[in-house]
């Protein structure tokens, strides 16, 4: 699996899941999260040539045909497969709320 | 939605499902399929700005920050949403075959 | 573009009621935090309470805590500031504010809204 216990060990040029931190203010411009300041949300990198962890029939056909067709700008794309919630803490005025925000950090990627 | 309703009708320039053909000999060097020759399969393509069909919560995110660091290699890519399957006609010997292939076509797209 | 219009202010008197009105556009659909403010003259901006558009949670200040309601009408893309028993010192230039990135909760602090109304003048007098 294209997962962080493979894709952070390894120096994989092809699609896999990359590090990445992202503060809530700087990058994001959002003030409401109080806790925590930022998060590491990783990202999806690289390319997806054919049999790379393609996702389904239509993406081994698409592979395949980037292969016999190497010009053309029709190819698999490296997204998110597994994605995990992210807890935070917010404020209701100043009351403070706890919520988990859903499908905020990617474990892997797959060849969409 | 970034189907072919929309898509094939407009001009859009981001992420939507764009026209293509493939041809299963020229294209991908498959033999073993007798019908069709080849199918209109279609693609996407296109940006993933913020608020353009965003897939899920960490699709958002991303966009964002893409927004706020426009050279990041970071961003959403436009994937198909929709797929639906082809009918085939193939041979075992000289025993005509007909199979469905799930997930050939692509019908509309979203940013992940 | 985002844009809050606030309207509903005016005289009345001691013990009086107004609504306040903030119409808000530009925003993701039921997200983001409304938050209320007012300025009296020669006086610090007060945060009087707020709402989150998405789950209608709020938030009120102590000194208007029973006398001012926030409620909000996501179809309508207002919200509103309800307030009874209207004293002198309730006097000012009232104002809505928005943080539309908000999908949870809501500020008491003016220095999280991005985007503010232009105002409505409230006066209590007899």
């Known amino acids: 699996a294209l997962d962080t216990n493979y894709c952070f060990s390894s120096t994989e040029k092809n699609c896999c899941v990359r590090q990445l931190y992202i503060d809530f203010r700087k990058d994001l411009g959002w003030k409401w999260i109080h806790e925590p300041k930022g998060y590491h949300a990783n990202f999806c990198l690289g390319p997806c040539p054919y049999i790379w962890s393609l996702d389904t029939q239509y993406s081994k056909v698409l592979a395949l045909y980037n292969q016999h067709n190497p010009g053309a700008s029709a190819a698999p794309c490296c997204v998110p497969q597994a994605l995990e919630p992210l807890p935070i803490v917010y404020y209701v005025g100043r009351k403070p709320k706890v919520e988990q925000l859903s499908n905020m950090i990617v474990r892997s990627c797959k060849c969409s | 939605a970034l189907d072919t309703n929309y898509c094939f009708s407009s001009t859009e320039k981001n992420c939507c499902v764009r026209q293509l053909y493939i041809d299963f000999r020229k294209d991908l060097g498959w033999k073993w399929i007798h019908e069709p020759k080849g199918y209109h399969a279609n693609f996407c393509l296109g940006p993933c700005p913020y608020i353009w069909s965003l897939d899920t919560q960490y699709s958002k995110v991303l966009a964002l920050y893409n927004q706020h660091n426009p050279g990041a290699s970071a961003a959403p890519c436009c994937v198909p949403q929709a797929l639906e399957p082809l009918p085939i006609v193939y041979y075992v010997g000289r025993k005509p075959k007909v199979e469905q292939l799930s997930n050939m076509i692509v019908r509309s797209c979203k940013c992940s | 573009e985002v844009q809050l219009v606030e309207s509903g202010g005016g005289e009345v008197r001691p013990g009086g009621s107004l609504r306040l009105s903030c119409v808000v556009s530009g925003f993701t659909k039921d997200y983001g935090a409304i938050g209320w403010f007012r300025q009296a003259p020669g006086q610090e901006r007060e945060g009087l309470g707020c709402i989150a558009r998405k789950d209608g949670d709020t938030w009120s200040a102590d000194s208007v805590k029973g006398r001012f309601t926030i409620s909000r009408d996501n179809v309508r893309n207002t919200v509103y500031l309800q307030m009874n028993a209207l004293k002198p010192e309730d006097r000012g230039v009232y104002y809505c504010?928005?943080?539309?990135?908000?999908?949870?909760?809501?500020?008491?602090?003016?220095?999280?809204?991005?985007?503010w109304g232009q105002g409505t003048q409230v006066t209590v007098s007899s």
């Open positions: 504010a928005g943080d539309p990135s908000a999908l949870y909760g809501c500020s008491d602090r003016s220095s999280e809204y991005q985007y």
